[in-house]
């Protein structure tokens, strides 16, 4: 807390300008009117202040707006945003995408801080859904943003927003998140032709069911091994050797290097060894010839 001291003669700020640049903490407190600061916040970003000085300016705004800052002030916070706590931000009502962009710009280069996470949360809740423009903005600043959302939160993403998603935005998504995103992507890209569709849908395939993988295997897509390894194990297991061969195309040879890793390992265990041998890759661990395979799950379903 800054002590209340009288402003020295001739030091009263008539406007926010660089004459304040070397004011001591107590001088800023005594000589800068909070209402003046609020109306001239845009000027603060043209003046280099120390963090200590920024603390004083924040304190003034807090006193002026105990219920939370108006958006006209928030939009021009600049580096002062770095001084805000999540508790401060929860009092805000941010509706303009321009305001969001301005504050994310200040935080550029930093990891997503609790302040930024709170800001985004407030903004998205205020909008009701994660629309394309917002998603575009957020993933531009934070490529991992989508994967930081829960499946429940992802359910509010409209399919139209999926067009803004880049492959790197999904790098850290887990299967539960891709389960939610995949149907949206399928819907978003449904009117594209085969090869273009595959390019767009590829990053989302970690959420694809077996029937969609079977359909893709009929389209000469040549899926790479990196994508195949990210597929759901339960979706890969029912695929036949012929279907996997068609799905991977020339990349099928990569199965040998991955034979000890899921989902390849589990898939091999489900295939007849003779079928695996047709690939000529030396894959071992399939069901020996002459063995009868009982699908117990099917039996249970029938009973």
């Amino acid at each position: 807390e800054v002590e209340k001291t009288a402003c020295p003669s001739g030091k009263k700020a008539r406007e926010i300008d660089e004459s304040l640049i070397f004011y001591k903490k107590w001088e800023l407190e005594a000589c800068v009117d909070a209402a003046l600061l609020a109306t001239q916040m845009d000027r603060v970003n043209a003046i280099p202040f120390t963090y200590e000085q920024l603390d004083v300016l924040k304190h003034k705004l807090d006193e002026l707006y105990p219920q939370g800052y108006p958006e006209s002030v928030i939009q021009h916070l600049g580096y002062l945003f770095l001084k805000m706590s999540p508790e401060d931000i929860r009092k805000w009502n941010v509706t303009s995408l321009e305001t969001l962009k301005a504050l994310l710009e200040v935080n550029k280069g930093h990891e997503m801080s609790p302040q930024v996470a709170t800001l985004i949360d407030r903004f998205v809740k205020g909008r009701g859904q994660l629309d394309k423009d917002t998603l575009d903005t957020l993933t531009a600043f934070y490529p991992g943003y989508l994967c930081s959302l829960s499946p429940e939160e992802l359910s509010s993403v409209p399919p139209s927003s999926i067009w803004a998603v880049r492959p790197q935005d999904l790098d850290t998504c887990d299967p539960r998140q891709l389960d939610v995103l995949y149907p949206k992507a399928r819907l978003a890209f449904q009117n594209m032709n085969g090869s273009e569709y595959f390019v767009k849908i590829q990053s989302f395939l970690g959420g694809a069911p077996t029937e969609d993988l079977k359909a893709l295997s009929q389209q000469n897509v040549s899926m790479d091994l990196a994508t195949f390894m990210k597929l759901r194990t339960d979706a890969v297991l029912p695929l036949t050797v012929a279907e996997v061969q068609k799905l991977l195309g020339p990349h099928v040879e990569g199965l040998k290097a991955e034979e000890r890793h899921r989902p390849v390992r589990d898939w091999i265990l489900r295939q007849r060894q003779d079928d695996l041998d047709t690939l000529g890759l030396g894959l071992q661990g399939g069901i020996p010839n002459g063995y009868l395979v009982l699908d117990l799950s099917m039996q249970e379903a029938l009973s």
């Epitope: 280099p48 120390t50 001084k83 280069g109």
Partner: antibody, heavy 119, light 106 residues
Framework: EVQLLESGGGLVQPGGSLRLSCAAS????????MSWVRQAPGKGLEWVSA????????YYADSVKGRFTISRDNSKNTLYLQMNSLRAEDTAVYYC????????????WGRGTLVTVSS | IQLTQSPSSLSASVGDRVTITCRAS??????LAWYQQKPGKAPKLLIY???SLESGVPSRFSGSGSGTDFTLTISSLQPEDFATYYC?????????FGGGTKVEIK
């Protein structure tokens, strides 16, 4: 090209005076606060003085207060440091440095000019 | 505010992970910058706001910390990284620098 170029250094006797200049190019000079930072031979960096974009506000380290004067001529894109009553401990390479627009760290430095105070 | 860097010098090999610390005599939030200086050259900004990488600086450099304790890390030392590194606080006036850490070839 964005750059800063210092000049004016040299050998001077204790008690003498020297004026350093720093010519700026490649950016809007008047929009940025500027600083002088020095480095004694084999030693670390020391912030000496700073000036606001318009030149209206100045700051000095206690070690040079009353002896050094910082100024700028925005029409010539030049920063100055007038050094009077020089002492042996003022011997150093003097760098001029540009402050970023909002905070007090330096994103551009000159190559420096050596000031030697010796009898 | 006094900034104390440690170690004052260190020997390392190309490919090594190098960590330099900077301790402030009082809390400075994240108001810290790191600079690299090579002999006879001007300092060069590497990191600002304790952890933000300056544009054009290789990603092997990273900064962390807040309050009084800060760290500069070089994940895999390259031949061009042998230099002296300085921290600087911009929390309040007067601005101050650490004493420097010289990184030498082992």
């Amino acid at each position: 090209e964005v750059q800063l170029l210092e000049s004016g250094g040299g050998l001077v006797q204790p008690g003498g005076s020297l004026r350093l200049s720093c010519a700026a190019s490649g950016f809007t000079f008047s929009s940025y606060a500027m600083s002088w930072v020095r480095q004694a031979p084999g030693k670390g960096l020391e912030w000496v003085s700073a000036i606001s974009g318009s030149g209206g506000s100045t700051y000095y380290a206690d070690s040079v207060k009353g002896r050094f004067t910082i100024s700028r001529d925005n029409s010539k894109n030049t920063l100055y440091l007038q050094m009077n009553s020089l002492r042996a401990e003022d011997t150093a390479v003097y760098y001029c440095a540009k402050v970023i627009r909002q905070l007090w760290y330096f994103d551009l430095w000159g190559r420096g000019t050596l000031v030697t105070v010796s009898s | 505010i006094q900034l104390t860097q440690s170690p004052s010098s260190l020997s390392a090999s190309v490919g090594d992970r190098v960590t330099i610390t900077c301790r402030a005599s009082q809390g400075i939030s994240s108001a810290l910058a790191w600079y690299q200086q090579k002999p006879g050259k001007a300092p060069k900004l590497l990191i600002y706001d304790a952890s933000s990488l300056e544009s054009g600086v290789p990603s092997r450099f990273s900064g962390s910390g807040s309050g009084t304790d800060f760290t500069l890390t070089i994940s895999s030392l390259q031949p061009e990284d042998f230099a002296t590194y300085y921290c600087q606080q911009f929390n309040n006036y007067p601005l101050t620098f650490g004493g420097g850490t010289k990184v030498e070839i082992k």
